[in-house]
């Protein structure tokens, strides 16, 4: 699509995965395309097949190694190419010089659990997954709580401006069902974005004791 708009967006999970999305106006759904990754200072290269995710959008994951292995550093540059089959040949559609630590999106936090719950408050903890040791403590979190009768979009965002893998939710209503989600973002990187939201953790506050409010 010479005059159409295309977009090639990739993110590094900080360990061993680069996830890419390629979209192009007017492209055929059954077009066969791939992403090729060529690092400037590594012996390996990697390819993934772009699979359709919507009408004119394809996605794939470049698996660089074992999930917790540190495959790239801040000095690496990976040349990413989108190649699509046209008849008998592969045609280069897009090229990006990819700086992994400028384009970070971590995995969603995992292992959410209720540490302690009362009538009006709940303490919740979580863990980060496949996050590079390079970050040390340079991470931030956002959390949100789903109250009855509301949507996730309506939930106010709670910001934790440091690497704090727990939160104490307060001013909750007794004997009420809630859901909780958290996401993480490194402070590093011009194009870095928030991780996906964690799987929701459902919890229920304790009922108020008869005759008194705890």
């Amino acid at each position: 699509a010479v005059n159409g708009t295309s977009q090639f967006t990739c993110f590094y999970n900080s360990r061993a995965n680069i996830s890419c999305v390629w979209s192009q106006d007017g492209a055929l759904q059954d077009t066969s395309c791939q992403v090729h990754a060529w690092p400037d200072r590594r012996r390996w290269n990697q390819t993934c097949e772009l699979l359709p995710v919507s009408q004119a959008s394809w996605a794939c994951n470049l698996i660089l190694g074992a999930p917790d292995s540190q495959k790239l550093t801040t000095v690496d540059i990976v040349t990413l190419r989108v190649l699509c089959r046209e008849g008998v040949r592969w045609r280069v559609m897009a090229i990006q010089d990819f700086k992994p630590f400028e384009n970070l999106r971590l995995m969603a936090p995992i292992s959410l659990q209720v540490v302690h719950v009362e009538t009006h408050r709940c303490n919740i903890s979580w863990e980060i997954s496949q996050a590079s040791h390079y970050f040390e403590r340079h991470l931030e979190f956002e959390a949100r709580t789903l109250s009855p009768g509301h949507t996730w979009e309506e939930a106010p965002l709670l910001t934790l401006k440091q690497k704090q893998e727990w939160i104490c939710l307060e001013t909750l209503t007794p004997d009420t069902q809630y859901e909780f989600q958290v996401r993480v973002k490194p402070l590093q990187g011009e194009f870095t974005t928030w991780s996906p939201w964690s799987q929701p953790l459902a919890f229920r506050t304790k009922p108020a004791a008869l005759g008194k409010d705890t």
Epitope: I77, M93, I95, D97
Partner: nanobody, 123 residues
Framework: EVQLVESGGGLVQAGGSLTLSCAAS????????VGWFRQAPGKEREFVAA????????LYADSVEGRFTISRDNAKNTVYLLMSSLKPEDTALYFC????????????????WGQGTQVTVSS
């Protein structure tokens, strides 16, 4: 904001050569990949070639592959288009353009544009 200024256009005989320059200034220009496009009278603007800054990876239109060479000089913040074996159908206004991250053949993928330099190839 990124500013792009093309130069090097002119009149040349068929079979001859010409080198166009695209000088850039502005915010962190060395992060932006650059493409060349051209527009002949009465025709749509078309992709010619593009290059990434860091790896120097290149992309060419089929019509110029093997005849044109795109290159860059990072120290001078300049991209060049060496045009050889020129044909009358290469006559056009040549534009350079900067993309944010990715080079493609689509003009809508480029965010910053120069004013153009005229190339005329006589038979």
């Amino acid at each position: 904001e990124v500013q792009l200024v093309e130069s090097g256009g002119g009149l040349v005989q068929a079979g001859g050569s010409l080198t166009l320059s695209c000088a850039a200034s502005g915010r962190a220009f060395s992060n932006y990949p650059v493409g060349w496009f051209r527009q002949a009278p009465g025709k749509e603007r078309e992709f010619v070639a593009a290059i990434t800054w860091l790896s120097g990876s290149t992309l060419y239109a089929d019509s110029v592959e093997g005849r044109f060479t795109i290159s860059r000089d990072n120290a001078k913040n300049t991209v060049y288009l060496l045009m050889s074996s020129l044909k009358p159908e290469d006559t056009a206004l040549y534009f350079c353009a900067a993309a944010l991250k990715t080079i493609t053949r689509g003009q809508n993928d480029y965010s910053y544009w120069g004013q153009g330099t005229q190339v005329t190839v006589s038979s």
